[in-house]
């Protein structure tokens, strides 16, 4: 028994950043006379948040009237709440010392935990395009979340990725917290449509989960297949050469037509199907006038995909040939390309 | 049961120091302050000083000079000494517990005399 | 130092009827949204007893016929009705202010 105990009912509370926190404390006594304060934290650094005798706390206010006659509820209201305010609060009586008020009781404190919700969760991946069969990272952030208890997944296309690196920073004791998680994919020819998610659990949330998405169509970069064939023409001077250019992504493609080795045309890929997969095709078509030429015609297509190395494949054209024959297809140059 | 018990001479010759024991029962000196408060002869009553649960003192300005209040707590005794004392020193000397001065001893008297 | 001037320095009141005492505090003995004034009562060759603390409530123990009341400097302690057992000295005491000082006591006798 003391002849003044400042109780603190409440050992912790927990309120949603944005919200109101309710302090609690009563006195046993009003004798002697001197002022309640309220600090965050212990010691000779311990921060004011509330004093009875004096100053301005426009985010505190009193839950009972202090100027009442026997009021001995000394509990507070801290509003619009944020990670920062985390801590542990103590309710002070103070004595009218002299010359200056003396601290006579604290109660045991309250700690105050404050619940903040992560921020929305942002997906990047690489900053250059790969190719299928590469394995690309994506990483994954986000902020500002309390307490530091986090789950976070990876998905691809609805199914959950395992190759995956989370750290939560910082490891010890803060007002909030951060996330940052780095995957690993392996890109395959049918990802142009494919979606890469991270999801985010947080007690805040209520089973509700945040999720940041990336697609793989800024990722991926899906090389053409080439294919020269030759078609007979009415005019039987005439011989249509075609380059199908074949499941390619993104769009960006400019072909060149050589005739012995000579750039007879380019062209620039406008009008291309789009394949169920999300990957393009295109076709580009050569007319040759054979009785221009003695010899035989060496025809190549080249194509220039996203900015990489050409790849090309050549048709021999026959001159001596009947124009309805076909002649032999070469293998095709890939020069450079990065299949996987 | 609260209780509160004044002892020590009753007589005190003039530039002595006064010293009196308050001894408590009932309630704990770290949880208390323990007021010495008294009476001359026919008059009012003067509030000399309290130590507070703490050990921490305040005294009356007036006495300021000559009072010191002290306590062993493991022996439940709060002390009083008063140096250099005259006949107007001479009352009866009361202890009484806390701020709010709710349980008061029976009181002592000091004579201060040669 | 706060000065507590008492009125009347005597009184003497039939059983049954009421006594009001008056303390005067030469500055204000209001802190916090109280007043820090007490009363206490004394019988001859006893120590002061409470009777009142924070200018208006009651002690434990002690009968509602007593009452107080006040704020600021001017406060009053009641004894209604009065009774036999009343007479004894009685005394306001502040302490709000560094010294504690006592009122010089009013005496009520009864009839």
């Known amino acids: 028994e003391e002849e003044l105990q400042v109780i603190q009912p409440d050992k912790s509370v927990l309120v949603a950043a944005g919200e109101t926190a309710t302090l609690r404390c009563t006195a046993t006594s009003l004798i002697p006379v001197g002022p309640i304060q309220w600090f965050r934290g212990a010691g000779p650094g311990r921060e004011l948040i509330y004093n009875q005798k004096e100053g301005h706390f426009p985010r505190v206010t009193t839950v009972s009237d202090l100027t009442k006659r026997n009021n001995m509820d000394f509990s507070i209201r801290i509003g619009n709440i944020t990670p920062a305010d985390a801590g542990t609060y103590y309710c002070v009586k103070f004595r009218k010392g002299s010359p200056d008020d003396v601290e006579f009781k604290s109660g045991a404190g309250t700690e105050l935990s404050v619940r903040a919700k992560p921020s929305a969760p942002v997906v990047s991946g690489p900053a250059a395009r790969a190719t299928p069969q590469h394995t690309v990272s994506f990483t994954c952030e986000s902020h500002g979340f309390s307490p530091r208890d986090i789950t976070l997944k990876w998905f691809k296309n609805g199914n959950e990725l395992s190759d995956f690196q989370t750290n939560v920073d910082p490891v010890g004791e803060s007002v909030s917290y951060s996330i940052h998680s780095t995957a690993k994919v392996v890109l395959t020819r049918e990802d142009v449509h494919s979606q890469v998610i991270c999801e985010v659990a947080h007690v805040t949330l209520q089973g509700d989960p945040l999720r940041g998405t990336a697609n793989l169509s800024e990722t991926i970069r899906v090389p053409p297949t080439l294919e020269v064939t030759q078609q007979p023409v009415r005019a039987e001077n005439q011989v249509n050469v075609t380059c199908q250019v074949r499941k390619f992504y993104p769009q960006r493609l400019q072909l060149t037509w050589l005739e012995n080795g000579n750039v007879s045309r380019t062209e620039t890929a406008s009008t291309v199907t789009e394949n169920k997969d999300g990957t393009y095709n295109w076709m580009s078509w050569l007319l040759v006038n054979v009785s221009a030429h003695r010899d035989d015609v060496k025809l190549t297509c080249q194509v220039e995909h996203d900015g990489q190395p050409a790849v090309s494949k050549s048709h021999d054209l026959k001159v001596s040939a009947h124009p309805k024959e076909q002649g032999s297809n070469t293998a095709a140059e890939n020069t450079g390309s990065n299949e996987r | 049961q609260v209780q509160l018990q004044e002892s020590g001479p009753g007589l005190v010759k003039p530039s002595q120091t006064l010293s009196l024991t308050c001894t408590v029962s009932g309630f704990s000196l770290t949880g208390y302050g323990v007021n010495w408060i008294r009476q001359p002869p026919g008059k009012g009553l003067e509030w000399i000083g309290i130590?507070?649960?703490?050990?921490?003192?305040d005294y009356n300005s007036a006495l300021k000079s000559r009072v010191t209040i002290s306590k062993d707590t493991s022996k439940n005794q709060v002390f009083l000494k008063l140096s250099s004392v005259t006949a107007a020193d001479t009352a009866v000397y009361y202890c009484a517990r806390a701020g709010k001065m709710d349980y008061w001893g029976q009181g002592t008297t000091v004579t201060v005399s040669s | 130092d706060i000065v507590l001037t008492q009125s009347p320095a005597s009184l003497a009141v039939s059983p049954g009827q009421r006594a009001t005492i008056t303390c005067r505090a030469s500055e204000s003995v209001d802190s916090y949204g109280n007043s820090f004034m007490h009363w206490y009562q004394q019988k001859p060759g006893q120590p002061p007893k409470p009777l009142i603390y924070l200018a208006s409530n009651l002690e434990s123990g002690v009968p509602a016929r007593f009452s107080g009341s006040g704020s600021g400097t001017d406060f009053t302690l009641t004894i209604n009705p009065v009774e036999a057992n009343d007479a004894a000295n009685y005394y306001c005491q502040q302490n709000n202010e560094y010294p504690w000082t006592f009122g010089g006591g009013t005496k009520v006798e009864i009839k």
């Open positions: 130590i507070w649960g703490d050990g921490s003192t």
